[in-house]
Amino acid sequence: MSITGISPITEYLASLSTYNDQSITFALEDESYEIYVEDLKKDEKKDKVLLSYYESQHPSNESGDGVDGKMLMVTLSPTKDFWLHANNKEHSVELHKSEKPLPDQAFFVLHNMHSNSVSFESKTDPGVFIGVKDNHLALIKVDSSENLSTENILFKLSETHHHHHH
């Protein structure tokens, strides 16, 4: 699954919430960022995440489409120079400071499983998705396509505005 371009094809600034409308928030603690899943008070401002969309070639041996086997990969950055990373060993989702080009652990395959929700599959560990576990984000193994609609891996994007990249 190689990224076909160095630049994102499009970018959005959005807030991220769970299928059950809990907000994904990011807090700086002891010089590192923690990720929380929580109910926000009525007027509390939602944290925003920059989603950068990249085109990726699907591995041709799995695709009957020849040149057409494209997927969308996303990176998620809640603050400058920090990106969500998949830690496949610990089954955790972490925020790390990175420089471009970003490591593969920062890329997630985008799935629209339902009309109003998305899922993020780890590029480095196919079949493993960002999900919610004990009020935190974690990596969750999904063993069959039927389980892709399981609510704990579904997220809603509330777009706040378009982000003009150059």
């Epitope: 009957g64 494209k70 997927m71 799935h111 009309s115 505005h161 982000h163």
Partner: antibody, heavy 122, light 107 residues
Framework: QVNLLQSGATLVKPGASMKMSCKAS????????VSWVKQSHGKSLEWIGE????????NFNKEFKDKATLTVDKSTSTAYMELTRLTSEDSAVYYC???????????????WGQGTLVTVSS | IIVMTQSPKSMSISVGDRVTMNCKAS??????IAWYRQKPGQSPELLIY???NRYTGVPDRFTGGGYGTDFTLTINSVQAEDAAFYYC?????????FGGGTKVEIK
């Protein structure tokens, strides 16, 4: 190569229903969203709705919510659209389409069927 | 619903000419625009997506540009086969909407 083969032209009476088909080949049918688009004679294009064959999830243009029903048959890689309570306003060419990306819609129409002409007349 | 307005409605040009058509969105859509060509009696075909990305197999004489509310499709050195209707479409968000089209005729 990717191919979307639609059912043939139909003449239907006002008030009746009709179901058209779109048989997909050359790709993994369940992994791509399928959309339907209407083009009235000499007019522009209108998006009706989309369906994800893997889960059956769908998403509609409000204007067509009570007009169109989208279904799929995974065993034959075929998408269907049923139109109900037909009037002369529904006379049009209807296209099934598919996007460029696995798993994700983005509502971009990279592949098109040849279209099904529906004529509503008594 | 975001309205897409195309201009001009039609144009008549000679083979080899350079032509630019416009598409205006009623509100900011970022770069979420696609362009299609529909030749007489045929289904539409995707030319450009995300405002400026040429789709696979589309000749490089087609160029898309713009951001926000104003977009252009330019055809450098128009060919006889480019006689068609051209539609812009807002992508990504539901419901996607199409412009009314620009008809390109070859003199």
């Amino acid at each position: 190569q990717v191919n979307l083969l639609q059912s043939g032209a139909t003449l239907v009476k006002p008030g009746a229903s009709m179901k058209m088909s779109c048989k997909a080949s050359g790709y993994s049918f369940t992994d791509y969203w399928v959309s339907w688009v209407k083009q009235s004679h000499g007019k522009s294009l209108e998006w009706i709705g989309e369906i994800y064959p893997n889960s059956g999830a769908n998403n509609f243009n409000k204007e067509f919510k009570d007009k169109a029903t989208l279904t799929v048959d995974k065993s034959t890689s075929t998408a269907y659209m049923e139109l109900t309570r037909l009037t002369s306003e529904d006379s049009a060419v209807y296209y099934c389409t598919r996007g460029p990306y696995y798993y994700s819609s983005q509502i971009i129409f990279a592949y098109w069927g040849q279209g099904t002409l529906v004529t509503v007349s008594s | 619903i975001i309205v897409m307005t195309q201009s001009p409605k039609s144009m008549s040009i000679s083979v080899g000419d350079r032509v630019t058509m416009n598409c205006k969105a009623s509100q900011n859509v970022g770069n979420n625009i696609a362009w299609y060509r529909q030749k007489p009696g045929q289904s539409p075909e995707l030319l450009i997506y995300y405002a400026s990305n040429r789709y696979t197999g589309v000749p490089d004489r087609f160029t898309g540009g713009g951001y926000g509310t104003d977009f252009t499709l330019t055809i450098n050195s128009v060919q006889a086969e480019d006689a068609a209707f051209y539609y812009c479409q807002r992508i990504y968000n539901s419901p996607p909407t199409f412009g009314g089209g620009t008809k390109v005729e070859i003199k």
